[in-house]
Interface confidence: low
Amino acid sequence: DAHKSEVAHRFKDLGEENFKALVLIAFAQYLQQCPFEDHVKLVNEVTEFAKTCVADESAENCDKSLHTLFGDKLCTVATLRETYGEMADCCAKQEPERNECFLQHKDDNPNLPRLVRPEVDVMCTAFHDNEETFLKKYLYEIARRHPYFYAPELLFFAKRYKAAFTECCQAADKAACLLPKLDELRDEGKASSAKQRLKCASLQKFGERAFKAWAVARLSQRFPKAEFAEVSKLVTDLTKVHTECCHGDLLECADDRADLAKYICENQDSISSKLKECCEKPLLEKSHCIAEVENDEMPADLPSLAADFVESKDVCKNYAEAKDVFLGMFLYEYARRHPDYSVVLLLRLAKTYETTLEKCCAAADPHECYAKVFDEFKPLVEEPQNLIKQNCELFEQLGEYKFQNALLVRYTKKVPQVSTPTLVEVSRNLGKVGSKCCKHPEAKRMPCAEDYLSVVLNQLCVLHEKTPVSDRVTKCCTESLVNRRPCFSALEVDETYVPKEFNAETFTFHADICTLSEKERQIKKQTALVELVKHKPKATKEQLKAVMDDFAAFVEKCCKADDKETCFAEEGKKLVAASQAALGL
């Protein structure tokens, strides 16, 4: 249904509060370096304009597209060229090229200061003094650091952020109440951002078909009682929502997400028995709850898949006449029977099935040719099963920190050209798979682990894309979305790598390490470990372990010393010399 004024339509649908929040998120995700006050000014101007359009949809400029209105507004920023360089050239373009240009300049790793959490009393005072500004600042700081954060979900995070301060700032022990809640929001927020980043990468790098295949598999696992036509409808709608959000169309995205939640709840009888509680919640909580809802029980007595997809005489006819629908049905039927498989495994199986039909339906005896197609699935299923078993055993033996270190060494040897901060960040996140997934029973381990690893490896891919340094990373990231993890797993030590020159400065530490949190101290040690491997890629596990144990003892000793700085200087030199000797540097 066409509206005379798109901006008035969205303002009315979303309400002023959500409209303003979403415009702020959109602007902060595009112009990540702009000061908060500048963005607030732009948002207020857009909001006032929207109100004039609500009053009179025929008013001047009210018929313009949202991209035109928002782009024009962004291009009024005076310091655009000084702050953003070539991004300013986007403003010379017409829509839709201008918006595409802005999208291409989104920076996954913006050069912004780390967010430092002030004292609890300071935060509570700021919250009470001006709640609206305090919450806007939260949206702004998250959005500019996470330019692909799922905007309607960020509204949900902001609601929880507000609730935490409302409750805890009047508690007897404010810090004990607030800090765990803020930690939880921070960790969940990072996870949410990374998951959405994979969805956007899937759409932008591999196309709508790839995203739809992912969605068919995931929704079929989650809603195994829903009929194929129902799943297809949900996939179509979900694809539209994520295409909009990934494309910067945040108002449309939030509006369509609300419509999808409404549809799901109105039709929950034909979708899933697990939706009842979600559907009783307010909008933001409802949408979040639906997105996280547990898998429904599988229908009893599902017939064998072989009947329709191997034994039927219609296989090639069905495939030829409607390839994507037939493959979609295969994926739906396989996924609803296998909540124990990762989505990426299900997509690999569907790809194998598709490749087999492409080959066999052109053969003299198609049925004879594809009769054993399900046998080809066995090694594909066993590979992630074995990998997860081995890595969970290693995790249980080492614990999270040492398991992360094992992965740091493994990945630095595979792709030593990648920057040390990226290797540390990615390997630490890869290592978290242990505590996240190994606690689960066998039936839940693979979907937990492999789909989580897909999210983490996508972080490596988007960070590497900004500054490509390794052909091996580029190859694994671009060849196949569903085979990224097997591609990285298969990489051996890079024999072409020329070891990094030894630089004593890299291994010089100061007393400030003693005041760091345990997490920050781990990151310092892990950074040193990556640098060691880059200097000595052929170092054995035993050699590296000995050096790292010495390093841990050195930090502990000097942090207990009276004159810490002198200890770090003197003992540090000894440690470097001993390490060089141990590693033959």
């Epitope: 009682k225 009947a307 329709d308 037939f326």
Partner: nanobody, 115 residues
């Protein structure tokens, strides 16, 4: 977008007949086997009958064998279920589905057999 719209249900006395229809759109109807599934109040979905893409091969649940007949018109993109000698235990919402899944579709059509 794949859509299936069932019609033809209603209230009928035991021993009576009804003919259900299912209009399909959004996919190549003639390429797919189709089924009828029903769900009685408070019960799970129950597979009733299936037909292959060409209409030659038909299957029935034991409970409806000899009373129900499944058919299709690929030109009209429509699936049918002729139900004779209806019994009170046939009371349910009837859904058509693609393939041979025992899962229920979107809207369905209510069939009530009662005197």
């Amino acid at each position: 977008e794949v859509q299936l719209v069932e019609s033809g249900g209603g209230l009928v006395q035991p021993g009576g007949s009804l003919r259900l229809s299912c209009a399909a759109s959004g996919f190549t109807f003639g390429s797919f086997g189709m089924s009828w599934v029903r769900q009685a109040p408070g019960k799970g979905p129950e597979w009733v009958s299936a037909i292959d893409s060409g209409g030659a091969d038909t299957r029935y649940a034991e409970s409806v064998k000899g009373r129900f007949t499944i058919s299709r018109d690929n030109a009209k993109k429509t699936l049918y279920l002729q139900m004779n000698s209806l019994k009170p235990e046939d009371t349910a919402v009837y859904y058509c589905t693609i393939g041979r899944s025992a899962s229920r579709g979107s809207q369905g059509t209510q069939v009530t057999v009662s005197s």
